[in-house]
């Protein structure tokens, strides 16, 4: 059985205020069973950016259909970027557990920074 890898290809992503940013994340295995969540930052202070299972994340859309059984692309788009959105974003795989899911593996992170201002 292939060991799961979390691939975030961009180390740095330059974004423009007011525009949409695409954060890429793919996995190399469907196992273990469990959701992929997005966070900004690490440790206890990290900010939840997207959870497919619960919550309402109006500025976030997924690139692929996460409901498809064999989906391995967990990339997201964040619309209407502001300066407060800068930081390093991580896609994180959780292993299904009871009563709570357990963090299994994190991607290496993509740093989002502000690039050129809109003209």
């Amino acid at each position: 059985e292939e060991e799961l890898q979390m691939i975030q290809p961009e180390k740095l992503l330059l974004v423009t205020v007011g525009k949409t940013a695409t954060l890429h994340c793919t996995v190399t295995s469907l196992l273990p069973v469990g959701p992929v969540l997005w966070f900004r930052g690490v440790g206890p202070g990290r900010e939840l950016i997207y959870n497919q299972k619960e919550g309402h994340f109006p500025r976030v859309t997924t690139v692929s259909d996460l409901t498809k059984r064999n989906n391995m692309d967990f990339s997201i788009r964040i619309s209407s970027i502001t300066p407060a959105d800068v930081g390093t974003y991580y896609c994180v795989k959780f292993r299904k557990g009871s009563p709570e899911n357990v963090e299994f593996k994190s991607g290496p992170g993509t740093e989002m920074a502000l690039g050129a201002k809109p003209s």
Partner: antibody
């Protein structure tokens, strides 16, 4: 329906402590950042503190830094504000407010809890 | 820190008339501006977010416009129940979250 209900307000003397609670229902509490906002009698709104969805990230207004502590219990859907070393200028109605997303406005407000600091 | 200045401080308008409230930011906040309504003795209520979007359940007589530093809340045909204080809030730069000083709308 989203509901936020504050409790724990009252009359205290300068230097004393008080803990406010905010019971949340009608939404996935653990997915959202939460805030405390206060309003002194006859005055405008003043943001006090913010806590991220997981509870490990906090921010405070300069006026309360070092005296107030925000926390949350996601298993109980409850937000807290521990207020120490209270001053007369802390007299206000304290509102808990839900944040629309991790970097957003306040989309739901509680009814408020009155805190009076007087000798 | 971004400062929000609301004007006028008080606005007296007859029922059925248009009310225009202004909120000016000391630096750009893009479209990241919300308007909240607070009636006497009540908690604030979200009216408008992202400068122009009406919140759920808000009547269409309320509209928001503007971007950058200058924003307007318009009540197209004032009703008696619109008597309240209106606050703008920016969420482009934070912390801290900032509110304007408020505009009190009175019924003539």
């Amino acid at each position: 329906d989203v509901q936020l209900v504050e409790s724990g307000g009252g009359v205290v003397r300068p230097g004393e402590s008080l803990r406010l609670s905010c019971a949340a229902s009608g939404f996935s509490f653990s997915s959202y950042a939460m805030n405390w906002v206060r309003q002194a009698p006859g005055e405008g709104l003043e943001w006090v503190s913010r806590i991220n969805s997981g509870g490990g990230g906090t921010d405070y207004a300069e006026s309360v830094k070092g005296r107030f502590t925000i926390s949350r219990d996601n298993s109980e859907n409850t937000l807290y504000l521990q207020m120490n070393s209270l001053r007369a200028e802390d007299t206000a109605v304290y509102y808990c407010a839900k944040q629309y997303d991790w970097n957003g406005f306040f989309d739901y407000w509680g009814l408020g809890a009155l805190v009076t600091v007087s000798s | 820190e971004t400062v929000l200045t609301q004007s006028p401080a008080t606005l007296s308008v007859s029922p059925g008339e248009r009310a225009t409230l202004s909120c000016r930011a000391s630096q750009t906040v893009g479209s990241k501006l919300a308007w909240h309504q607070q009636k006497p003795g009540q908690a604030p209520r979200l009216l408008i977010y992202d400068a122009t979007n009406r919140a759920t359940g808000i009547p269409d007589r309320f509209s928001g416009s503007g971007s950058g530093t200058d924003f307007t809340l318009t009540i197209s045909s004032l009703q008696t129940e619109d008597s309240a204080v209106y606050y703008c809030q920016q969420y482009y730069y934070w912390p801290p979250y900032r509110f304007g000083g408020g505009t009190k709308v009175e019924i003539k």
